[in-house]
Interface confidence: low
């Protein structure tokens, strides 16, 4: 439905508050280095302009596309060239090339200071003094650090952020009330950002077909009672929503997401029995709830898959008539029967099925050729099952911190060229799979674990893409989206790697480590562990464990000492010498 003024249409649909919030998110995700005040000024100007268009859709410039309006506004920033360098060249281009250019300059790892949480009283005062500015600042800080954060979902986080301050700033013990809520929002926010980053990578690097296949599999698991036609409609709509958000079209994305939630709730009888509670909630909560809803029960009378996809004489005819529809039906039928499989495994099975039909439907006796196709699935299914079993046993044996360390060693040996901060961040996240998924019964472990690992490995891929240093990482990241995890799992020690020169400075520690939180202290120790492996990639587990145990004892001893700094200096030298001897450096 064409509107005379797109900006007026979105302003009316979304309302002023959401409109302003989404424009702020969009601008902060594009110009990640700009000061908060500059962004607020731009947003206010866009909002005032939108209001003139609501009053008169024929007013000057109201017929321009949102990309044109927003791009023109971003290009008025005076310091564009100094702050962003070649990104300023985007402003010389016309739409749609200009928007594509801005998208390409989004930085997954912007050089921004770490967000330090002020004292609770300071935050509460700021919240009470100017609630609107306080919440805008939250949107701005998250959006600029996470340039692909799912914008409508960020509005939901902001709503929870506001609720936390509203409740806790009047509590008797403000800190006890507020801090756990902020920790939860931070952890959920990081997870939400990473999940969305994978969706955008899927669309941008592997195309719409790849994303749609993912969506068919996931929605079929979630809504196994829904008909294939219903799932296909939801997949089409969901693809549009995510394409828009990943493309920076945040107003359209939020509007279309609201429409999709409305459709799902109006048609829940033919979609899922689990949606009732979600559909009673307000819009932002409703959309979030639907996105997280548990899988519906599988219909009890599902026939065997073999009849339609192996035994039928019409397999090749059906495949030839509409390849993607037939493969979509296969994926739908397989996924709705297998809530116990990861989405990536289901996609591997569908790919194997497709490859088999491509080969067999050209053979002399197609049926004879594809008759055993389901037997080919067995090793594909067992590989992640066995891997998860082994790693959950290791996790239960070691606990999260030591399990992370085992993964740090494993991944540093596989891809030692990757920067130490990236290896630490990615391995720590890989290690969280243990506490996240191993507690589940077997039927839920694989979808939890392997789909989570896909999200974490995508972080490695997007960070590595910014500064590529390893052909092996590039290969695993680009060859196949669904085989990334098996590709990384299959990597052995990189025998071509020339060990890093030993630098005593890397292993020099000071008394400030004693005042760090447990998490920060772990990161320091894990950073040292990665550096050790880079110096001595052939070091055995036992050697590394001995050095790390000595290191932990050294930190504990010096943090208890009266003169901490002297202890770190003197005992540190001894530790470095002993470690060098132990590792033969």
């Amino acid at each position: 439905d064409a509107h005379k003024s797109e900006v007026a249409h979105r302003f009316k649909d979304l309302g002023e508050e959401n409109f302003k919030a989404l424009v702020l998110i969009a601008f902060a995700q594009y110009l990640q280095q700009c000061p908060f005040e500059d962004h607020v000024k731009l947003v206010n100007e866009v909002t005032e302009f939108a209001k003139t268009c609501v009053a008169d859709e024929s007013a000057e410039n109201c017929d321009k596309s949102l990309h044109t309006l927003f791009g023109d506004k971003l290009c008025t920033v005076a310091t564009l060239r100094e702050t962003y360098g070649e990104m300023a060249d985007c402003c010389a281009k016309q739409e749609p090339e200009r928007n594509e250019c801005f998208l390409q300059h989004k930085d997954d790892n912007p050089n921004l200071p770490r967000l330090v949480r002020p004292e609770v009283d300071v935050m509460c005062t700021a919240f009470h003094d100017n609630e609107e500015t306080f919440l805008k600042k939250y949107l701005y800080e998250i959006a600029r650090r996470h340039p692909y954060f799912y914008a409508p979902e960020l509005l939901f986080f902001a709503k929870r952020y506001k609720a936390a301050f509203t409740e806790c700033c009047q509590a008797a013990d403000k800190a006890a009330c507020l801090l756990p809520k902020l920790d939860e929002l931070r952890d959920e926010g990081k997870a939400s950002s990473a999940k969305q980053r994978l969706k955008c990578a899927s669309l941008q690097k592997f195309g719409e077909r790849a994303f749609k296949a993912w969506a068919v599999a996931r929605l079929s698991q979630r809504f196994p009672k829904a008909e294939f036609a219903e799932v296909s409609k939801l997949v089409t709509d969901l693809t549009k929503v995510h394409t828009e958000c990943c493309h920076g079209d945040l107003l359209e994305c939020a509007d279309d997401r609201a429409d999709l939630a409305k459709y799902i709730c109006e048609n829940q009888d033919s979609i899922s029995s689990k949606l009732k509670e979600c559909c009673e909630k307000p819009l932002l909560e409703k959309s979030h709830c639907i996105a997280e809803v548990e899988n519906d029960e599988m219909p009890a009378d599902l026939p065997s898959l073999a009849a339609d996809f192996v035994e039928s004489k019409d397999v090749c005819k059906n495949y030839a008539e509409a390849k993607d529809v037939f493969l979509g039906m296969f994926l739908y039928e397989y996924a709705r029967r297998h809530p116990d499989y990861s989405v990536v495994l289901l996609l591997r099975l569908a790919k194997t099925y497709e490859t088999t039909l491509e080969k067999c439907c050209a053979a002399a006796d197609p049926h004879e050729c594809y008759a055993k196709v389901f037997d080919e699935f067995k090793p594909l299914v067992e590989e992640p099952q066995n891997l998860i079993k082994q790693n959950c046993e290791l996790f239960e044996q070691l606990g999260e911190y030591k399990f992370q360390n085992a993964l740090l060693v494993r991944y540093t040996k596989k891809v030692p060229q990757v920067s130490t901060p990236t290896l630490v961040e990615v391995s720590r996240n890989l290690g969280k799979v243990g506490s996240k998924c191993c507690k589940h019964p077997e039927a839920k472990r694989m979808p939890c674990a392997e789909d989570y690992l896909s999200v974490v490995l995508n972080q490695l891929c997007v960070l590595h893409e910014k500064t590529p240093v390893s052909d092996r990482v590039t290969k695993c990241c680009t060859e196949s989206l669904v085989n990334r995890r098996p590709c990384f799992s299959a990597l052995e020690v990189d025998e071509t790697y020339v060990p890093k020169e030993f630098n005593a400075e890397t292993f020099t520690f000071h008394a400030d480590i004693c005042t760090l939180s447990e998490k920060e202290r772990q990161i320091k120790k894990q950073t040292a562990l990665v550096e050790l492996v880079k110096h001595k990639p052939k070091a055995t587990k036992e050697q590394l464990k001995a050095v790390m145990d000595d290191f932990a004892a050294f930190v504990e001893k010096c943090c208890k000492a009266d003169d901490k700094e002297t202890c770190f200096a003197e005992e540190g030298k001894k530790l470095v010498a002993a470690s060098q001897a132990a590792l033969g450096l």
Partner: nanobody, 123 residues
Amino acid sequence: QVQLQESGGGLVQPGGSLRLSCAASGFTLDYYAIGWFRQAPGKEREGVSCIASSGGSTNYADSVKGRFTISRDNAENTVYLQMNSLKPEDTAVYYCAAAVLECRTVVRGYDYWGQGTQVTVSS
């Protein structure tokens, strides 16, 4: 090769007992619900009992409730049907079948089938 193999059938007197086994090869039973079915000559195949993949949920046909017990040993990759107080009308070929995670209400809902084992109850 994915296979289910029933064993333990035979000839038994009324009131006697048998223990049927269903062993899986080529795949792990952890992820599958296992159903026992029987088919008497000239009759439709009917459900006897089923156990879900977790082992937590079991169900029985009214005609065997209180007499038959289904159990599973995932370590052995085997499901058992203990049949006590057998009656002549229990005579049939007994089949086991596998379906992902949950028991099904219809015969065609099962993905894998065994060849069957004969149970005859006669004096």
